[in-house]
């Protein structure tokens, strides 16, 4: 949404992002000429964050709250440029596209990865999930594939019934929904994750030597 728009409010920062920013500033002050090894730096930050007490984290949580309020305030008055509106009208009653086996797997283990590595970007979380999926034998993917197939079957029935009923007028006219309905932060994150994971899934190559013994 409006990635190239200079007037678009800066995205809100999490408490952890504020903490990392502070770490960076401290590091710069102590070692003004040293170049930063980012993977090493983020690892140290992540470890430090994990050992911090709730009281110590409080300062950064307050900063994040204030930034969230700033972001919401600015977004109220922000008007996206023409042609920047998000997609055609989507009927909220339309059946939701079913998840793939890989996406089901991701939704199981994403919380653990995010929890254990709070500093990981969405892309890195998706990458890690992709590695885990590739580490999984074909027969161990079967429970996910079976569930995905069941959900696909259900979706196909639901979409057939939905189409038989006929789409709502707004959708027929192709009305553009200018304002994105307010969604929970988690839902937005999951949408981004889903896109990343679908890219991962396209790329990922299955282990060749696996045999298909069902559990």
């Amino acid at each position: 949404m409006g990635k190239g728009d200079p007037k678009k409010p800066r995205g809100k920062m999490s408490s952890y992002a504020f903490f990392v920013q502070t770490c960076r500033e401290e590091h710069k002050k102590k070692h003004p000429d040293a170049s930063v090894n980012f993977s090493e730096f983020s690892k140290k930050c992540s470890e430090r964050w994990k050992t911090m007490s709730a009281k110590e984290k409080g300062k950064f949580e307050d900063m994040a709250k204030a930034d969230k309020a700033r972001y919401e305030r600015e977004m109220k008055t922000y008007i996206p440029p023409k042609g920047e509106t998000k997609k055609k009208f989507k009927d909220p009653n339309a059946p939701k596209r079913p998840p793939s086996a890989f996406f089901l797997f991701c939704s199981e283990y994403r919380p653990k990865i995010k929890g254990e590595h709070p500093g990981l970007s969405i892309g890195d979380v998706a990458k890690k999930l992709g590695e885990m999926w590739n580490n999984t034998a074909a027969d161990d993917k079967q429970p996910y594939e079976k569930k995905a197939a069941k959900l696909k079957e259900k979706y196909e029935k639901d979409i057939a019934a939905y189409r038989a009923k006929g789409k709502p007028d707004a959708a027929k006219k192709g009305v553009v929904k200018a304002e994105k309905s307010k969604k929970k932060k988690e839902e937005e994150e999951d949408e981004e994750d889903e896109e990343d994971e679908e890219e991962e899934e396209d790329e990922e190559d299955e282990d060749e030597e696996e045999d298909d013994d069902d559990e």
């Epitope: 939704s107 919380p111 653990k112 885990m132 034998a137 027969d139 282990d207 030597e209 045999d211």
Partner: antibody, heavy 119, light 108 residues
């Protein structure tokens, strides 16, 4: 400290039912796969059932398929095993164990609960 | 399904000696996903080694794992009195998870 504590074992007649529980503490239960593994008296270890973090996907050993049901309540940090149509060969100590994702080594185990199926 | 065979069935040694326990699979263990557990009477198994050679948290360095493909070994360099127990190997590369039948390590 990670702890797993099983309960619900006991003496039951063939054809009867039992529900085992495993109370977890000391870790974020909702992040982990959980397993039930059993050990018949004086015998080796046999996996029984597996469940993913959300509880939405499960798997069973052929020997218990259709008779046992694994479930979990993440709000209560508890794993369950509903055992129906019990047979003499189900007599064993039942352990709950924590795994990582998919088949994995079990890094923590409960102390076990003994199930005896006998008339 | 893969079958796991442990040998010997029983191993009689004295404290201070070196113990070598073997685990053989009927087919190659995928990515060497093999673990070793120790079980003492009346207790739950305890994870010692995973991924064939990585020591689990808190396991003394006298325990080491080696091997790949179908042949794996658990070595205890200098036996301590508390090491006398039953040892199981487990493959987790493919479903179903399979344990070996165990090796009893007893005091000579």
């Amino acid at each position: 400290e990670v702890q797993l504590l099983e309960s619900g074992g006991g003496l039951v007649q063939p054809g009867g039912s039992l529900r085992l529980s495993c109370a977890a503490s000391g870790f974020t239960f909702s992040w982990y796969d959980m397993w039930w593994v059993r050990q018949a008296p004086g015998k080796g270890l046999e996996w029984v059932s597996w469940i993913v973090p959300s509880g939405g996907i499960t798997a069973y050993a052929d020997s218990v398929k259709g008779r046992f049901t694994i479930s979990r309540d993440n709000s209560k940090n508890t794993l369950y095993l509903q055992m129906n149509s019990l047979r003499a060969e189900d007599t064993a100590t039942y352990y709950c164990a924590r795994g990582n994702y998919g088949p994995s080594p079990f890094d923590y185990w409960g102390q076990g609960t003994l199930v005896t199926v006998s008339s | 399904d893969i079958q796991m065979t442990q040998s010997p069935g029983t191993l009689s040694l004295s404290p201070g000696e070196r113990a070598t326990l073997s685990c053989r699979a009927t087919q190659s263990v995928r990515k060497n996903f093999l673990a070793w557990y120790q079980q003492k009477p009346g207790q739950a198994p305890r994870l010692l080694i995973y991924d064939a050679s990585s020591r689990a948290t808190g396991i003394p360095d006298r325990f080491s794992g080696s091997g790949s493909g179908t042949d794996f070994t658990l070595t205890i360099s200098r036996l301590e009195p508390e090491d006398f127990a039953v040892y199981y190997c487990q493959q987790y590369g493919n479903s179903p998870i399979i344990f070996g039948q165990g090796t009893r390590l007893e005091i000579k």
